[in-house]
Interface confidence: low
């Protein structure tokens, strides 16, 4: 609520009133107030609010009180001249009380001409037959926003899911600048994207960096005078590479004798991204291996012919054991047994010569 100072009768000055050089102004104020019928002290329906002068544009201060027979502004303890007031008066139909409203215009020059430690201020004073009431003080300040940020965000390279802090201290200004953050020119809304948090001192926190947070971030300071952008900080969210699992061992690369087997892995689990580190260590492992050499089979020499049997044949044989086939070597080609007719020995009859009969080993 407002601080209302109540003064009864015509004692409308108080300790901070220095009086006014505008004597004719005070002559306008009534020396006494009618006491019949009794009416309450003025009550402010609208009090003047603090205002900011932007560039050279003057500001209007406004107040409204009821009941009020007179209403004036004073600024920095001095009465504002009557001719500088714009006053309007009407009767409130419900209460029958007089409602007065008043506005004044304050220029940049007036504010700049004030010397002293206190800011330029104005307040409204309203009179009724019961006395006076003062409104709160409304401060009038020259608005500005300096160009230089006190702290600007710096670019960062961060790993996936790492927390990121981007700092920003806006330029000095009146009124104090509001701060918002842009991600690639889009306003960050922490209510919508809960991975973002803006601290009370305007820093941006990315709680757990995602790949999609790789972007340009800009701190924006704004007040009623201007909007300023900080330098852009580029955040790169990188992913360090990780090895896949090893493949199975390959077969031995030598068909005969010493060789090697190998297995491989790739840096794809995940693959490095945005400058993340490549996997450390070997992508290929080898171990020695020996493959037994194949031995092709070879025949032994033929045996001697057997004696001529009762069937008038004799035979001879050989073996595939000189050497026998080994480790996938080739078998011997050709006959294991040979037989042919004969007429000697135990042969019971003479037979005409016939072709050899070949018996093949299985």
């Amino acid at each position: 609520g407002s601080h209302h100072h109540h003064h009864h009768g015509s004692d409308y000055k108080d300790d901070d009133d220095k009086g006014s050089q505008d004597d004719e102004f005070f002559h306008e104020l009534p020396e006494t107030f009618p006491s019949d019928p009794p009416e309450p002290l003025p009550h402010f329906l609208i009090e003047p609010e603090e205002a900011y002068i932007v560039k050279n544009k003057p500001v209007n201060l406004y107040c409204k009180a009821s009941p009020a027979t007179q209403i004036y502004f004073k600024c920095n303890s001095e009465w504002v001249h009557q001719k500088d007031h714009v006053v309007d008066e009407r009767v409130d139909e419900t209460s029958g009380l007089i409602v007065r409203e008043v506005s004044i215009e304050i220029s940049r020059q007036q504010v700049e001409e004030l010397f002293g430690p206190e800011d330029y201020w104005c307040q409204c004073v309203a009179w009724s037959s019961a006395g006076t009431t003062k409104s709160r003080k409304a401060y009038v300040r020259i608005a500005y926003l300096r160009k230089t940020f006190e702290q600007e965000p710096l670019g960062k390279e961060v790993s996936l899911e790492q927390e990121v802090l981007l700092q920003c201290r806006p330029p000095e200004g009146i009124p104090v600048a509001e701060v918002e953050w842009l991600k690639n020119e889009d306003i960050i809304d922490p209510a919508e994207d809960r991975n973002f948090y803006i601290t009370i001192d305007h820093n941006l926190i990315i709680k757990q960096a995602r790949l999609s947070d790789t972007a340009n971030y800009t701190c924006v300071a704004k007040n009623i005078v201007a909007k300023r952008k900080s330098t852009t900080a580029t955040v790169i969210v990188y992913v360090n590479g990780g090895w896949s699992t090893w493949t199975e061992w390959s077969v031995c690369n030598s068909r005969c004798g010493r060789g090697y087997q190998k297995r491989t892995r790739t840096c794809t689990n995940p693959a490095p991204l945005n400058g993340g580190a490549f996997c450390e260590g070997q992508s290929v492992q080898k171990i020695a291996c020996t493959t037994l050499c194949p031995v092709d089979g070879r025949w032994t020499s033929w045996s001697k012919w057997s004696t001529c049997g009762t069937e008038c044949t004799h035979w001879r044989r050989r073996e595939c054991t000189a050497p026998a086939p080994k480790n996938g070597g080739k078998d011997c080609d050709g006959l294991v047994l040979q037989s042919k007719n004969c007429t000697d020995g135990l042969c019971m009859q003479a037979a005409p010569d016939s072709d050899d009969v070949a018996l093949y080993g299985s």
């Epitope: 991600k183 690639n184 889009d186 306003i187 809304d189 919508e192 994207d193 809960r194 995602r210 790949l211």
Partner: antibody, heavy 119, light 107 residues
């Protein structure tokens, strides 16, 4: 109140290029992600891709080689071209606005336009 | 791509019922989940964004919850105008993907 309106032919022949335009009214095309989404008859929703007024685009890899999305900020419009269409591309095509960042949600949609691919 | 699985695919309920629809992501998507309502012949309408934030103008009987991989849309007291198909959509990474939909029918 932001409104989106799709326009373009309702019938496209197989192997030809489907072309649609979305006109945005009641608001600026700046600083949002403008998406195309489709819905085959009786089926679910499939995101095709988006474009930002800066020209940044992102397409669904399943369609990427056939999709072109462009923006004309002066006309407050963005467009979709889908080449080499087949019957499988028959769908209601929606344009939608993705609010804020690419984290989207789609808060405004066009009413949709049915595109039939048939000879 | 992140797969979104909705269950049930359809359900029957009566006016006044409490209805729950679930959506599961194939990997963690934090809170990057949106819910939409679609009526026949109409465009989808945003109900809930960022898993639990109610879109402006949407009745408070709709609520969303969940984080990570499991999410829920709840209609506290089903109204006649709520009979529709509901879709979830992840916005954690592109390609943006939708669930298959849940059709809410009158019992």
């Amino acid at each position: 109140q932001v409104q989106l309106q799709e326009s373009g032919p309702g019938l496209v022949k197989p192997s030809e290029t489907l072309s649609l335009t979305c006109t945005v009214s009641g608001g600026s095309i700046s600083s949002y992600f403008w998406s195309w989404i489709r819905q085959p008859p009786g089926k679910g929703l499939e995101w095709i891709g988006y474009i930002h007024n800066s020209g940044t685009t992102n397409q669904n890899p399943s369609l990427k080689s056939r999709v072109t999305i462009s923006v004309d900020t002066s006309k407050n419009q963005f467009s979709l071209k889908l080449s080499s269409v087949t019957a499988a591309d028959t769908a209601v095509y929606y344009c939608a606005r993705g609010r804020g960042m690419a984290t989207l949600p789609f808060d405004y949609w066009g009413q949709g336009t049915l595109v039939t691919v048939s000879s | 791509d992140i797969q979104m699985t909705q269950s049930p695919s359809s359900l029957s309920a009566s006016v006044g019922d409490r209805v729950t629809i679930t959506c599961r992501a194939s990997q963690s998507i934090s809170s990057y989940l949106n819910w939409y309502q679609q009526k026949p012949g109409k465009a989808p309408k945003l109900l809930i964004y960022a898993a639990s934030s109610l879109q402006s103008g949407v009745p408070s009987r709709f609520s969303g919850s969940g984080s990570g991989t499991d999410f829920t849309l709840t209609i506290s007291s089903l109204q006649p105008e709520d009979f529709a198909t509901y879709y979830c959509q992840q916005s954690y990474s592109t390609p943006l993907t939708f669930g298959g939909g849940t059709k809410v029918e009158i019992k």
